[in-house]
């Protein structure tokens, strides 16, 4: 089995992983996730992109097999998706305009898009950050 199969990204029945949010509570909406608001970037059959998911099902330490590894601390939101569109939303977090394109010292960061598009398939290629958009890469 090819360990690079994007295990969650093209599931027919669409179990979509949503990264835990930090800093904002909303524990009631998100059940027992650690820190709250869930962002889901997959399309449903109706073609609606879900932003904030207020699903409180099965949020306690979900464990999902992904590409030969185990991911914990994410919340599985069960919903049917268009075949092939049940992708992981690596694009999570609250955006503040003044946080874009800045490094730790506040200097503009090279090579970063000012409006980074949502790429629901990105987790197959990048380790996702649930912390949002602020950038930390002092390149000494």
């Amino acid at each position: 089995m090819d360990v690079f199969m994007k295990g969650l990204s093209k599931a027919k029945e669409g179990v979509v992983a949503a990264a835990e949010k930090t800093k904002q509570g909303v524990a009631e909406a998100a059940g027992k996730t650690k820190e709250g608001v869930l962002y889901v970037g997959s399309k449903t059959k109706e073609g609606v992109v879900h932003g904030v998911a207020t699903v409180a099902e099965k949020t306690k330490e979900q464990v999902t097999n992904v590409g030969g590894a185990v991911v914990t601390g994410v919340t599985a939101v069960a919903q049917k998706t268009v075949e092939g569109a049940g992708s992981i939303a690596a694009a999570t977090g609250f955006i503040k305009k003044d946080q874009l394109g800045k490094n730790e010292e506040g200097a503009p960061q090279e090579g970063i898009l000012q409006d980074m598009p949502v790429d629901p398939d990105n987790e197959a290629y990048e380790m996702p950050s649930e912390e949002g958009y602020q950038d930390y890469e002092p390149e000494a």
Epitope: V3, G7, G73, M127, E131, E137
Partner: antibody, heavy 122, light 116 residues
């Protein structure tokens, strides 16, 4: 100066447990995803586990899932690896390593510690 | 089952160039993978050299000489670490690494010998 200092290694019998620690300094610890990477004697590098900056997401290699637990205490700038049900094949030097966050992603590890040796033998 | 394949060894003369390959077996889009390269000398931890996704998205590690550069061969699904002007201190093990769907993966490593 960036420093990652691992500790907690040692000799343990098969089936036993160890807890590794990694003390970080010289960078914004909470903004880095941290990983444990190991290297068996004479072998290559093997990624073991990773944890996001807030600790909200953790990742494990198949070879250790269900036995190892990664965690972090950002108030202490410390990373941990709790290793249970240890096997002979877990014998290795264990490195603590970190990768910076940018936007929605974490980069790979660009900061590495010197490593701590774990020997599992009866 | 290796997903990142590196030749076990490579040797070259001082002053020459060495091209280290890292072949990626993947069902994903090769162009989207960011390939990391590390150097490790005996008794020392790995050191980050560089990462390469494209000419527009690459990064050289702090203090890493420009003799070290990254590229990709899309036709072979391979990442390439090019070391030009080889020096005796370049003799080391070199590892590539990528992230894919919930895990970091390392190649098996290439032992580079600088002859002479």
């Amino acid at each position: 100066e960036v420093q990652l200092l691992e500790s907690g290694g040692g000799l343990v019998q098969p089936g036993g447990s160890l807890r590794l620690s990694c003390a970080a300094s010289g960078f914004t610890f909470s903004s880095y995803a941290m990983s444990w990477v190991r290297q068996a004697p004479g072998k290559g590098l093997e990624w073991v586990s990773a944890i996001s900056g807030s600790g909200g997401s953790t990742y494990y290699a198949d070879s250790v899932k269900g036995r190892f637990t990664i965690s972090r205490d950002n108030s202490k700038n410390t990373l941990y690896l709790q290793m249970n049900s240890l096997r002979a094949e877990d014998t290795a030097v264990y490195y603590c390593a970190g990768g910076a966050r940018r936007g929605r992603i974490y980069y790979g590890m660009d900061k590495w510690g010197q490593g701590t040796t774990v020997t599992v033998s009866s | 089952q290796a997903v990142l394949t590196q030749p076990a060894s490579l040797s070259a003369s001082p002053g020459a160039s060495a091209s280290l390959t890292c072949t990626l077996r993947s069902s994903g889009d090769f162009s989207r993978y960011r390939i990391y390269w590390y150097q490790q000398k005996p008794g020392s931890p790995p050191q980050y050299l560089l990462r390469y996704k494209s000419d527009a998205d690459k990064h050289q590690g702090s203090g890493v000489p420009s003799r070290f550069s990254g590229s990709k061969d899309a036709s072979a699904n391979a990442g390439i670490l090019l070391i030009s002007g080889l020096q005796s201190e370049d003799e080391a093990d070199y590892y590539c690494m990528v992230w894919s769907s919930g895990a970091w993966y390392f190649g098996g490593g290439t032992k580079l010998t600088v002859l002479g």
